[in-house]
Interface confidence: medium
């Protein structure tokens, strides 16, 4: 039997399948448009509808905004034609694609409106410290739903050189294991880069004043981060795990990492930031257990134990 080409598949029906959707978390900034994506396949052709916070949401019926809705698609863009509009559309969205055979549902898409990030206005007092002592210059970037990159510079836009003695922590603070008179500068500036808003903001400059001494006193290591002797944390399977230890002391301490509960997974471990950071790529069940950092100098040592519990993502 020969079936004409134009007839082939004509009566083949397919239930809806979501083929493309927005990420689960979507951050919108004041000058941005809002684009929510939902594409689906199915025969007969699928019909789309959206809910926001569980209530039927019709983009085209929203007042005071311009909406572009793609034909044969659930995707739409709301044009931000005023400075308040993103606030109005915060919420949890869901797309439903339906035909005679059923309905497919997207995951929940949490739309968050954020202001362009700003540092709180503050007066930064000079930091005074004796040569050889340790010091921490705080960054404390403003909270943000999106990831940010932090770096320290001086007023000439030159990066502050980091080494075993001077380190920026994961939290953005700048740690000095011991200060030298050459660290005496009035313009330590923490910059935060928010890729989502294409924004770079900078903290007020910190004036670090180092008082010279005739004899620097040797000090055994002490951990500046973490400050306690042990901590428990949960790592998700398949995700990276980052552990950090930053120490002070004179001479500058060195950091070693040990795993008392078994061998270090050498093929998946990298050490960064002059050994102060241990990064484990793609955590597995076998990575459960204790990880220990050891800070050592000629006068002694300090340690921190991380107890890691691996859970399914």
């Amino acid at each position: 039997i020969q079936i004409p080409e134009e007839y082939e598949g004509h009566h083949v029906m397919e239930p809806p399948v979501i083929t493309e959707q927005s990420p689960r978390r979507l951050v919108v900034f004041p000058t941005d448009d809002i684009s929510l994506k939902c594409e689906a396949s199915g025969k007969p052709e699928v019909q789309f509808r959206w809910t926001r916070d569980g209530v039927h949401f019709k983009p085209k019926e929203e007042l005071g905004v311009t909406v572009y809705q793609s034909p044969h698609s659930g995707s739409f863009t709301i044009t931000g034609n005023n400075s308040n509009f993103a606030q109005r559309f915060q919420g949890i969205y869901r797309c439903f694609a339906s035909n005679k055979l059923g309905t497919a549902m997207s995951h929940e898409i949490r739309l968050m409106a954020e202001g362009a990030p700003k540092w709180p206005k503050e007066t930064v007092k000079p930091v005074e410290v004796e040569e050889g002592e340790s010091v921490v210059l705080p960054c404390n970037p403003p909270p943000s739903a999106e990831p940010l990159r932090i770096y320290w510079m001086n007023s000439k836009i030159l990066h502050i050189k980091q080494d075993e003695r001077v380190t920026m922590g994961q939290n953005g603070n700048l740690y000095f294991a011991n200060v030298l008179t050459s660290d005496n500068h009035s313009d330590y500036i923490c910059h935060a880069h928010f890729p989502g808003t294409r924004t770079i903001i900078q903290k007020e400059p910190i004036d670090l004043r180092v008082k010279a001494t005739n004899s620097m006193i040797d000090r055994k290591p002490r951990l500046l981060f973490p400050t306690n002797s042990s901590s428990h944390l949960v790592a998700l399977q398949g995700q990276p795990l980052v552990l950090e230890c930053i120490a002070e002391g004179f001479p500058t301490p060195t950091i070693k990492w040990l795993r008392p509960s078994g061998p270090m997974p050498a093929d998946r471990v990298t050490y960064q930031n002059h050994n102060k950071t241990l990064q484990l790529l793609k955590v597995g069940e076998e990575d459960d257990g204790e990880y220990r950092c050891l800070a050592e100098n000629s006068l002694g040592s300090a340690r921190h134990a991380y107890y890691v519990t691996v859970e399914a993502a």
């Epitope: 900034f29 004041p30 000058t31 916070d53 005071g64 931000g80 034609n81 005023n82 400075s83 308040n84 509009f85 993103a86 606030q87 109005r88 559309f89 915060q90 919420g91 409106a113 954020e114 202001g115 362009a116 700003k118 808003t197 294409r198 924004t199 770079i200 903001i201 900078q202």
Partner: antibody
Amino acid sequence: QVQLVQSGSELKKPGASVKLSCKASGYTFTSYWMQWVRQAPGQGLEWIGEINPSNGRTNYNEMFKSRAVLSVDTSVSTAYMQLCSLKAEDTAVYYCALYDGYYAMDYWGQGTLVTVSS
Amino acid sequence: DIVMTQSPSSLAVSVGERVTMSCKSSQSLLYSSNQKNYLAWYQQKPGQSPKLLIYWASTRESGVPDRFSGSGSGTDFTLTISSVKAEDVALYYCQQYHSYPFTFGQGTKLEIK
């Protein structure tokens, strides 16, 4: 730190036009809406309009829609407000201010005094 | 347009006294999507630009002394100065940024006896 520096005082005759500038620094110019607000002598604050520097989109108070034009030059991080067909009642201090759709107008320029007198 | 009405138009108090001023809007300033009231309070000292004190009706702007507080929801709002200082002499404006055009109250003038 964020700074908005406005152009100097202007003395204009009725019927003339004036173009005020607001030079921004210390933040990413295209990430915030720029607002314009005026204050007549001894009077309260009046919102004129706003502009999105990233795409030039504007919103105006209906009272000013026919006479005010907001614009930006992103290459020099500067916002402008032009007001035409000036009347004596337009004598006021004109402020630019930042608003990011979130925290209200939290940074203001120092203001520009426009005097309209024959 | 949303009309903002402030009262009193002026008040004179002694240093150390508690002071409250009111702001009423002709429509609700509460957004249901985020449960925030889009109302701000500004302080304007003679010859200066306005300065933001409070946003979202009750959130104090960073660097603003904690003697300033905002309260209220919907259409009725209050700015309170718990213990007035001589430097608080100024005009205080409320402003709605819920709907266009943004509108300000006519202001409350605070003076020291």
